[in-house]
């Protein structure tokens, strides 16, 4: 399950502080991997692999950690400091207009278009018209129309608003 | 724009138990507390308490402790608060109030509801 | 709990002069993060309250410059430089420097 609010969100109360960890707030403000107390008197650590913080914040709360669906791998656990860092699985890609579930990327481009990008975590394979060079982005064409390709390798990680 | 609509109000016999409810729109539900004040007849207010809706954790003023339930129901963007063991002293028109999720700025509350005139009587 | 009490408690006043409020707090609000957590809500005849200053002397959005918060410590004030009509109604102050949330019991303020 994703969570619904990420710290960049919740943004607008993050200024500038120290760079050291301390236990209780620093200029009104806790360190990653920390949330103000009720008070605002404390600095209490976020819970490891449940929640996390990212800035210098005076959040009341850590943000819950991300948990990757099915159809997504975890390139990374959840820290007190860091999300979890969830990708696609090979084969299929996020669109960032629905970033909410991966989708199979397309097998092949249809006739008269040539492939020029490879599935990739965060899109579909891309095709253009052999002659004019540009871009297609309609619909999965019939099988007798494609052109088969492999599914390319990941790149680096698509990062989750939340 | 911000809106917190309240239940309409209630009577309620010494005892029994009475659930309020207000529900928000306007703005993301998840991405603010929802606090609950009490105004007895010819007095000042009270803080009851507030519900956190991203996490479900909830914070209470210790005096109403064990008298106040509150929790939400994310799907309709409805913030609840359930009154227990109702008694006379109870009687009092109730508001719920959004605040902010950061200490800086989380003590003062910038949208009130409309209010829930809870009377309870014998 | 913090015990906030203001005074007057009730306040007639003539539309176009000038109106004050005090509010006391039982302890300082000043927080130990150098922040002071006082704030000022009217609520006008038949409706909920609505926040006029947060933090002293912070205006909210659409309240008009007319009204303003000062003080500090224990002692605070809200002024009205011109009073109008519609600014009748209870005026509470209220504190978040200590848990739990307290207000002051009101100050009503009416057209003489």
């Known amino acids: 399950e994703s969570a619904l609010i990420t710290q960049q969100d919740l943004a607008p109360q993050q200024r500038a502080a120290p760079q050291q960890k301390r236990s209780s707030p620093s200029e009104g403000l806790c360190p990653p991997g920390h949330h103000i107390s009720e008070d605002g008197r404390d600095c209490i650590s976020c819970k490891y692999g449940q929640d996390y913080s990212t800035h210098w914040n005076d959040l009341l709360f850590c943000l819950r950690c991300t948990r990757c669906d099915s159809g997504e791998v975890e390139l990374s656990p959840c820290t007190t400091t860091r999300n979890t860092v969830c990708q696609c699985e090979e084969g299929t890609f996020r669109e960032e207009d629905s970033p909410e579930m991966c989708r199979k990327c397309r097998t092949g481009c249809p006739r008269g278009m040539v492939k020029v990008g490879d599935c990739t975590p965060w899109s579909d394979i891309e095709c253009v018209h052999k002659e004019s060079g540009t871009k297609h982005s309609g619909e999965v064409p019939a099988v007798e129309e494609t052109v088969t390709s492999s599914p390319g390798t990941p790149a680096s990680p698509c990062s989750l608003s939340g | 724009q911000v809106q917190l609509v309240q239940s309409g109000a209630e009577v309620k016999k010494p005892g029994a138990s009475v659930k309020v409810s207000c529900k928000a729109s306007?703005?993301?539900?998840?991405?603010?507390?929802m606090n609950w004040m009490k105004q007895s007849p010819g007095m000042s207010l009270e803080w009851i308490g507030r519900f956190n809706p991203y996490n479900g954790d909830t914070f209470y003023n210790q005096k109403f402790k064990g008298k106040a339930t509150l929790t939400v129901d994310k799907s309709t963007s409805t913030a609840h608060m359930e009154l227990s063991s109702l008694r006379s002293e109870d009687t009092a028109v109730y508001f719920c109030a959004r605040s902010a999720y950061y200490f800086d700025s989380g003590g003062y509350f910038d949208y009130w509801g409309q209010g829930t005139l809870v009377t309870v009587s014998s | 709990d913090i015990v906030m009490t203001q005074s007057p408690l009730s306040l007639p006043v003539t539309p176009g002069e000038p109106a004050s409020i005090s509010c006391r707090s039982s302890?300082?609000?000043?927080?130990?993060?150098?922040?002071?957590?006082l704030h000022w809500y009217l609520q006008k005849p038949g409706q909920s309250p609505q926040l006029l200053i947060y933090k002293v002397s912070n205006r909210f959005s659409g309240v008009p410059d007319r009204f303003s918060g000062s003080g500090s410590g224990t002692d605070f004030t809200l002024k009205i430089s011109r009073v109008e009509a519609e600014d009748v109604g209870v005026y509470y102050c209220s504190q978040s420097t200590h848990v739990p949330w307290t207000f002051g019991p009101g100050t009503k303020v009416e057209i003489k």
């Open positions: 302890q300082s609000l000043v927080h130990s993060n150098g922040n002071t957590y």
């Open positions: 306007g703005y993301s539900f998840i991405g603010y507390f």
